[in-house]
């Protein structure tokens, strides 16, 4: 029998990730609510312990007993100012046991307290369950990742935490080493190489120098933020919204916990969004009062409203530079890592800070770190295979897999492009009341409904108890394997009873022609919609450039440049576009490109001005014309309670 | 002073084209937009659009696409408007008009007859 | 698009007597960020081009006589001239520039 894999695993502040390198390359792997990251949450109630998506989902409704960034508690004294501050913000209580912390919580009618080893323990248990469940035996050996900056105590308690968790600590690796190690820039064979690992999560931002040589690394400079990343951001939207809310509909929501959290939902996942859209939809219905709140926002007012955020990442890197007593121009290589570093304008102060040196962003920035541990894993359990060397591509799903709903719509479960093998699981229930049994029949495809869509196979899952449309909980399951074989399963989660099908290559599948021409003919039907994509294109053109536009005459670096006329008549003009937009979010197409174009009459002529034998165009570089616009319409951002 | 020029007078047949210019003095031509504006014999003021002096890009009213042009020189700080496929509904006095926070500025007008 | 409906389509009134012409628009012409309504009014006498007399619903353009005066705001507007005189003889036109452009129909205004 094949020896056991080791894992990687990247626990995180507030977001864990576990990877395994198997079969010659790395995998991340899924958790049961299919996502490939799992919140650092675990929550006691009355009844049980929830760790992960279960414990942060019920947050809310239960402040107290929900214990996240113990990260931040791990391997400090009580009296470490940095615990005290937090501890502060924090709605769970952390009392004092002998100068460690520990977190008081309720659980079963009883006071508990958890020291931070034990609490990242059951987030790494969570980890280590995962990764049974993909790899289908028990797991025991595991590299974990702490950030460059953990002392000697902090990556103790981390090891601990993971002996608690029944797991064979192989290595406490840095972070920044693995996010090097994933995009094997130890194996450049190039001398000695400079890395700026820019690490921007969920609640840290981390900026950590690195130099490799020969296999070697040493960190040569740390920097950054402990309270600085996406949850920021997500609270910029949310102020944002509760002021739009007010403004609309004259009513504050800012002190309903529910209709904030919803909102935070919705922001998250907006936000999310506008990393590869320029224009995401928030639909929430009923959030306050009975009142649908249907609003959208553009990449350019989310950049706006976090402008300060972003440009102070740079500091850090500045910091650190100055500490390892480097030039920018002396760094190699620059390696994005964290969530929050997919945000195009991120990206593009980083990039222009380094006069735009290109980032390594190739591997998934939230994975990045779990993916060189995982690396690391498989190199420290012996793995002598040439891939751990040489990392191959990695094969994908050509389209979209899916069920059919309600109403005939295709629902997928993995999306075109997924690299495979890939395993996603999500709930489904009941249309009717009593309703015995459930139909999953399986669809691949790109179009919204499944009658567009190619009919794989059918079954029938039966015998569902007597219940109340939308109670039975039917777990489906979408497992392909690194052949192209797909496994779909559904279970009553109420009975356990099952059933499967699956689907082979020669079964019903189509061939790489005909996959190319439902692509083709998605793209097609796509352009039905181009009458609404250009209409939001030109909105977003026209946001983007009233920001743009903006932001340049406010800039400091302009005083002294424009006259107080000139900076007066573009915020003016500006001030009267963002306004008239705020207010005519559904005109037409030739009213956008209208108003832009009087924005550009106003502006372009100034700013040039400034510009001219500058040897560029202008800030951000637009020309004459000014930034043309997005990609259209983002995704809706549908609403999850 | 600020000036705006306009074209003598047209007379053309039906399916002809033409071209009216709008020559700009007393003030820097790409900082303002120009708009033209139609006005049939007795009937009031209809806008037809308008073009960014600065970047060239024109914009149609409604009822002003398909056979209307708006183009500019700035080299000469002239605007121009050109009609192709002219019908005896166009027959009309064409306007140009500086715009700043309005149209405070007007050309004389060019008295365009399309009669076959 | 936006359509503006003048009335009357023409008036007669008295030298030194006050003429008041309507406007009203379809939709709001107010900007709540800015708070003005884009809304200007143009003279045009016979065989002459047009003149602005006014903009943003009551900012008078530089060189207008000050028995000129515009006022309203949303979709309801008026121009004021108080003291008609003889050299006041002309068409009145309300123009939009809220989005897009529009005129509206126009207003004669004659000696009675």
């Known amino acids: 029998m094949a020896k056991a894999a080791a894992i990687g695993i990247d626990l995180g502040t507030t977001y864990s990730c576990v990877g395994v390198f198997q079969h010659g390359k790395v995998e991340i792997i899924a958790n049961d609510q299919g996502n490939r990251t799992t919140p650092s949450y675990v929550a006691f109630t009355d009844t049980e312990r929830l760790i992960g998506d279960a414990a942060k989902n019920q947050v809310a409704l239960n402040p107290q007993n929900t214990v996240f960034d113990a990260k931040r508690l791990i391997g400090r004294k009580f009296g470490d100012p940095v615990v005290q501050s937090d501890m502060k913000h924090w709605p769970f209580q952390v009392i004092n046991d002998g100068d460690k912390p520990k977190v008081q919580v309720s659980y079963k009618g009883e006071t508990k307290a958890f020291y931070p080893e034990e609490i990242s323990s059951m987030v790494l248990t969570k980890m280590k369950e995962i990764a049974e469940a993909y790899l289908g035996y028990p797991v025991t050996n595991a590299v974990i990742t702490v950030p460059a900056y953990f002392n000697d105590s902090q990556r103790q308690a981390t090891k601990d935490a993971g002996v608690i968790a029944g797991l064979n600590v192989l290595r406490i690796i840095n972070e920044p080493t693995a996010a090097a190690i994933a995009y094997g820039l130890d194996r450049t064979g190039k001398g000695e190489r400079n890395v700026l690992i820019f690490d921007l999560g969920g609640g840290t931002f981390d900026v950590s120098i690195l130099t490799i040589d020969d296999g070697i690394f040493e960190v040569k400079a740390t920097a950054g933020d402990t309270h600085l990343g996406g949850e920021d951001f997500d609270n910029r939207l949310v102020n944002h919204f509760v002021e739009e809310f007010k403004r609309k509909h004259k009513k504050d929501i800012s002190q309903n916990k529910r209709a904030v959290r919803r909102l935070r939902t919705a922001c998250e996942r907006a936000k999310r969004t506008l990393s590869s859209s320029t224009q995401a939809s928030l639909e929430i219905d009923s959030l306050f009062e009975g009142i649908d709140f249907y609003t959208s926002i553009t990449r350019a007012r989310f950049e706006e409203l976090c402008s300060d955020l972003f440009r102070s990442t740079l500091e850090p890197v500045e910091k650190a530079l100055r500490d390892a007593k480097l030039d920018k121009a002396q760094i190699h290589d620059l390696v994005l890592v964290g969530g929050s570093t997919r945000i195009p304008k991120v990206q593009k102060l980083l990039q222009d800070f380094f006069n735009g040196r290109d980032l390594n962003k190739s591997i998934n920035p939230d994975e990045a770190v779990a993916y060189g541990a995982a690396v690391q894993a498989a190199i420290l359990m012996g793995d002598k295979s040439e891939n751990v060397q040489d990392l191959l591509l990695l094969d994908v799903a050509p389209l979209s897999l899916g069920l059919e709903t309600a109403g005939g719509v295709m629902t997928a479960l993995i999306k075109r492009n997924s690299t495979i093998p890939t395993k996603q699981t999500q709930i489904f229930t009941t249309y009717s009341d009593n309703q015995p049994g459930v139909l999953i029949q399986v669809y691949e495809g790109e179009r919204a409904m499944t009658k567009d869509n190619n009919l794989l196979g059918r079954f029938e899952l039966s015998g569902i108890p007597p219940a109340p449309r939308g109670v039975p909980q039917i777990e489906v399951t979408f497992d392909i394997d690194a052949n192209g074989i797909l496994n779909v399963t559904a279970t009553d989660k109420s009975t356990g009873k099952a059933n499967k099908i699956t689907i082979t290559n020669d079964k019903g599948r189509l061939s790489k022609e005909e996959i190319e021409r439902m692509v083709q003919e998605a793209e097609k039907y796509k352009a039905e919609d181009e009458v609404q994509r250009e209409r939001v294109s030109a909105k977003n053109a026209l946001e983007s450039y009233a920001f743009n536009m903006k932001s340049a005459v406010e800039d400091e670096g302009l005083k002294g440049k424009i006259s107080e006329a000139d900076k007066k008549k573009v915020l003016d003009k500006c001030q009267e576009v963002i306004s008239w937009l705020d207010a005519n979010t559904l005109a037409e197409k030739d009213e956008f490109e209208h108003k832009r174009k009087e924005l550009e009459q106003v502006c372009n002529p100034i700013i040039s001005g400034l510009y001219q034998g500058a040897g560029g165009p202008g800030p951000g570089g637009f020309g004459a014309q000014g930034p043309k616009g997005g990609s259209g319409s983002g995704p809706t951002i549908e609403e999850v309670d | 002073q600020i000036q705006l020029v306009q074209s003598g007078p047209e007379v053309k047949k039906p399916g002809a084209s033409v071209k009216v210019s709008c020559k700009a003095s007393g003030y820097t031509f790409t900082n303002y937009g120009m708009n033209w504006v139609r006005q049939a014999p007795g009937q009031g003021l209809e806008w037809m659009g308008w073009?960014?002096?600065?970047?060239?890009?024109?914009t149609y009213g409604d009822d002003f696409k398909g056979r209307f042009t708006f183009t500019t020189d700035t080299s000469t700080s002239t605007a121009y408007m050109e009609l192709r496929s002219l019908r005896s509904d166009d027959t009309a006095v064409y306007f140009c008009g500086r715009y700043d926070h309005a149209m405070d500025y007007w050309g004389q007008g060019t008295l365009v007859t399309v009669s076959s | 698009e936006i359509v503006l409906t003048q009335s009357p389509d023409s008036l007669a009134v008295s030298l030194g007597e006050r003429a008041t012409i309507n406007c009203k628009s379809s939709q709001s012409l107010l900007n709540s960020g800015t708070r003005k309504n884009y809304l200007a009014w143009y003279q045009q006498k016979a065989g002459q081009s047009p003149k602005l007399l006014i903009y943003w619903t009551s900012t008078r353009e530089s060189g207008v006589p000050d028995r000129f005066s515009g006022s309203g705001s949303g979709t309801d507007f008026t121009l004021t001239i108080d003291r008609l005189q003889a050299e006041d003889v002309a068409v009145y036109y309300c123009k939009q520039s809220y989005t897009l452009y529009t005129f509206g129909g126009g207003t004669k205004v004659e000696i009675k």
């Open positions: 073009i960014n002096t600065y970047t060239g890009e024109p």
